[in-house]
Amino acid sequence: AHKDTQTEAGSPFVGNPGNITGARGLTGTLRCELQVQGEPPEVVWLRDGQILELADNTQTQVPLGEDWQDEWKVVSQLRISALQLSDAGEYQCMVHLEGRTFVSQPGFVGLEGLPYFLEEPEDKAVPANTPFNLSCQAQGPPEPVTLLWLQDAVPLAPVTGHSSQHSLQTPGLNKTSSFSCEAHNAKGVTTSRTATITVLPQRPHHLHVVSRQPTELEVAWTPGLSGIYPLTHCNLQAVLSDDGVGIWLGKSDPPEDPLTLQVSVPPHQLRLEKLLPHTPYHIRISCSSSQGPSPWTHWLPVETTEGVPLGPPENVSAMRNGSQVLVRWQEPRVPLQGTLLGYRLAYRGQDTPEVLMDIGLTREVTLELRGDRPVANLTVSVTAYTSAGDGPWSLPVPLEPWRPGQGQPLHHLVSEPPPRAFSWPWW
């Protein structure tokens, strides 16, 4: 602060700053005027004794005589562009003249108006009957500022001992409502913005699988409360699980577009059809009222059961070479719909009953022919199976004679002990 200053006789100031009192945002101007002999000095503004380094001030110099050494009138104006609390205080002009410092009489700037909101209630979407908080904060001057909360334009009784609640704790709503707060001080009342609190259905719970099939899942859930608004529908999302599923499970959205199904309610049950057999999925559910959707449930891992292979083994062949028959095939080209557990082989002659054998996972087998009488029209058929059962059988393949150049049976298969090598004792 500038102590070595003079405002007594000999002061050049002929006009001193006045007073301004107003509300936040006010644009005001303080003015001082001085008359000096000789070159006009620069006017500096002080607030509470401290130089305003970045003052928004102007300065006009008007000569009152013919010569620059004659008397000058100097007017300095200080602009307050948007009054705020930090602008309040005592203002003075200061000049240095011939080694002496002069300051004007003080003018005062005060902030006083309707309460000013530092925080206002914000729009929210909350589940029905779920506690939530709203915030509102206001200040003067003048202080004190008291707050009054309104719900749907009706004042709420203040909590005992809390006449100025910054935070309104609400136990929960069953209908969409509006909230605002009024700030009161000696100058009057300011009303905050009106926040709309939208009541959404609660998150559904107990999402579970009722029944599982290879291409179908039946799921059910329990809806959450939805206030006075009946549920209109639920949306179920299903997404194929993959190796990276753990990365996105904690997030709200899966990496690719999920299958979304809308279902009318009640009942709170849904059959998911046309799924892939023996496939892991993740599902979640959200239910909606006229006010909007509930939060999604957490992703629930589910899996369809295995199905049977959709087609028979391919390229089945049966070739005779002396007393041996080599039967070969390839895995079905169509989906197996599960884990391949093995193959079954069936053979029959024109006048003999069908014989079934479990071959396991091998794709060729050597059969030992015994007996002295050939069987007429011998045919062989093969099927693949999963834990769900057998797939379709291949068309019966007749026994072909061995022709040179067709390759030899694989020795390790030929020499395999039973059950890989079988005897037909009636031949």
Epitope: G25, L26, T27
Partner: antibody, heavy 121, light 107 residues
Amino acid sequence: EVQLVESGGGLVQPGGSLRLSCAASGFSLSGSWIHWVRQAPGKGLEWVGWINPYRGYAYYADSVKGRFTISADTSKNTAYLQMNSLRAEDTAVYYCAREYSGWGGSSVGYAMDYWGQGTLV
Amino acid sequence: DIQMTQSPSSLSASVGDRVTITCRASQDVSTAVAWYQQKPGKAPKLLIYSASFLYSGVPSRFSGSGSGTDFTLTISSLQPEDFATYYCQQSYTTPPTFGQGTKVEIK
């Protein structure tokens, strides 16, 4: 005699630039705030911004912030409005005006007592 | 921003009539209101500042009043040269804003 004279208006393509000048005489720019105000054809008045020529501080309307720049050269007693990234909605007559805030030790608000003749952009 | 709403938007009057134009601010602007007169093709001219102070050189038939949110410009006896458009302007907060104008026409 106090006078303000604008110049520099003209036809410009959207996205283009233009610089308007406001030459003051009869008073010193250093002693007052200078405002720019515009008026679209057949419409009302819209404040564009102000400058304190003594300090060089400027203040702008949201509609022009970042595109327009107000400056002043006190040695030439002239204020300028540099307009960049012009849009069709900037079409208007542009006025410069001197602020009058009354006398006495203080005042709230201000008025504009001397206006230029305007220049059409 | 503070809105300034002028009424009427236009009026017809005869020479010698008393004319009143009102301006309403969307919030309290104290007395930080000015009134301007504008004729076609010309720049606005200051008539009234600080709500009620007559600017130097303006005829005394013009007067202004009001404080807070409601302001009035009165022409006590309309003269031929007064047919023009009149604007109010608030400068209590930045940005300063103008009313939409009132056109005074000859009846």
